[in-house]
């Protein structure tokens, strides 16, 4: 796959994933009422990160925001934080990657700068995706724990069902937002990885032809292909290092610009 295609696809995949992370964060259905005991309930409860809702069979839906910070479970606060971190990093990643796209020319930005920006955006997308996946997973774990705790209460806390009155405890199970979040986080992560892969190919190469170096005598010596080998754009300059038969490379050798005689 060409560098431009890899970079472009990575950007699009990350963008879709990022949109999914925002959607999941805003969705109300992080946890939904478990209908195992009563599949035809006239009242259906579901909860999000920001509010809880009740949908009546009549079609009326009432939602109430969590108008408190201190009264909320620490885990819920942590999940909120992780999702927001994912969104913020995603926004920065998108802004950086727009400037890094090979198909977009901005001023006299060289390929080296684009490579660095591509890698940066890739890393941001990876962290954004991981942050969302961790957030969703923490919430899912919290749900599973609460589900089994309330199940235990249902079967132990009824006084052996001796009384006539049953107290039905509402249990919650995975809502649609969890699946959206997992998929979105995964897409953002994959997109980020693709951006990082594209970065390797973006490291400036003056040509994709095979480079050949010459001694002053004109004797042809060993050569190695140029192109995409481990070019990250960070650290030392990796521009088609020349290999000489003898003698140490000078600083000039490493930094020298090719002449029209450098290539066959």
């Amino acid at each position: 796959m060409s560098v431009t295609a890899c970079q472009g696809l990575g950007f699009v995949v990350s963008l879709i994933g990022f949109a999914g992370i925002i959607a999941a964060t805003c969705m109300d259905q992080w946890s939904t009422q478990d209908l195992y005991n009563n599949p035809v309930t006239a009242v259906f409860n579901y909860q999000g990160l920001w509010r809880s809702c009740v949908r009546e069979s009549s079609g009326f839906t009432e939602c109430r925001g969590y108008f408190t910070l201190l009264g909320l479970p620490a885990m819920l606060q942590a999940v909120r934080a992780l999702m927001i971190v994912g969104i913020v990093l995603g926004v920065i990643g998108i802004l950086v990657s727009i400037f890094a796209l090979k198909c977009i020319r901005i001023g006299s930005m060289d390929d080296s700068a684009k490579a660095k920006m591509t890698l940066t955006s890739g890393i941001l997308f990876i962290i954004s995706g991981i942050s969302a996946i961790i957030g969703v997973s923490v919430f899912a774990n919290m749900l599973v724990t609460n589900f089994w705790m309330s199940t235990a209460n249902m079967y132990s806390g009824m006084g052996g069902m001796g009384g006539m009155v049953q107290t039905v405890q509402t249990r919650y199970t995975f809502g649609a937002a969890l699946f959206v979040g997992w998929v979105a986080g995964g897409l953002t992560l994959i997109g980020g990885v693709m951006m990082c892969i594209a970065c390797r190919g973006l490291t400036p190469d003056d040509s994709n032809f095979k480079a050949v170096s010459y001694h002053a005598s004109g004797q042809n010596v060993a050569y190695r292909p140029g192109g995409f080998k481990a070019s990250t754009g960070f650290g030392s300059n990796t521009r088609n290092k020349k290999i000489y038969d003898g003698g140490a490379r000078t600083e000039d050798d490493e930094q020298s610009h090719p002449t029209k005689y450098d290539y066959v």
Partner: antibody, heavy 118, light 113 residues
Framework: EVQLVESGGGLVKPGGSLKLSCAAS????????IHWVRQAPEKGLEWVAY????????YYADTVKGRFTISRDNAKNTLFLQMTSLRSEDTAIYYC???????????WGQGTTLTVSS | DIVLTQSPSSLTVTAGEKVTMSCKSS????????????LTWYQQKVGQPPKLLIY???IRECGVPDRFTGSGSGTDFILTISSVQAEDLAVYYC?????????FGAGTKLELK
Amino acid sequence: EVQLVESGGGLVKPGGSLKLSCAASGFTFSDYGIHWVRQAPEKGLEWVAYISSGSSTIYYADTVKGRFTISRDNAKNTLFLQMTSLRSEDTAIYYCAKWDRGNCFDYWGQGTTLTVSS
Amino acid sequence: DIVLTQSPSSLTVTAGEKVTMSCKSSQSLLNSGNQKKYLTWYQQKVGQPPKLLIYWASIRECGVPDRFTGSGSGTDFILTISSVQAEDLAVYYCQNAYSYPLTFGAGTKLELK
């Protein structure tokens, strides 16, 4: 003014069929779920069936499941109850009722009487 | 299915008297999501369809006189008429609005002495 008018009741032999209708006016019919509730002579109220605003959700009482079919035509603001395999215990006044916030029947029709007798 | 037990089955009172009738549920009608109790009260006069009085156990429907008051926990509910009038003579039904099948109590018949 909200109005629900039932029609189609009458005398039917056991095992027979009949279709009840409920014409609605005075509110946006397509926005509300509607129920059928019946009342046997000198008895209490018994819920029969429910259909949601867009017909996506339908529930029946166990006593009528498989024999009765609830449907609606939002274009004509009309609710239907198709009854088959009728029994003497189905004899009752059949009301259609509008379902509203709080899961309550805020408006009822005047009812139509079904008598199942040989 | 949720069973609603109404008591007494009939009640004979004099005008101006305070009346209370009970409705007990076999299952809690309290929804944890919004802390609302899904019990509804209806009044049915002879030869008429039922009329909505109270929903969510204590919310009076528009146009219902304030002498009618609903209260109760998740399983035990009470309808109170603070001062009975002649036009209040009817059968009063409670209804489970929490889960299907929707169920009604057998009714409490209010009669004048």
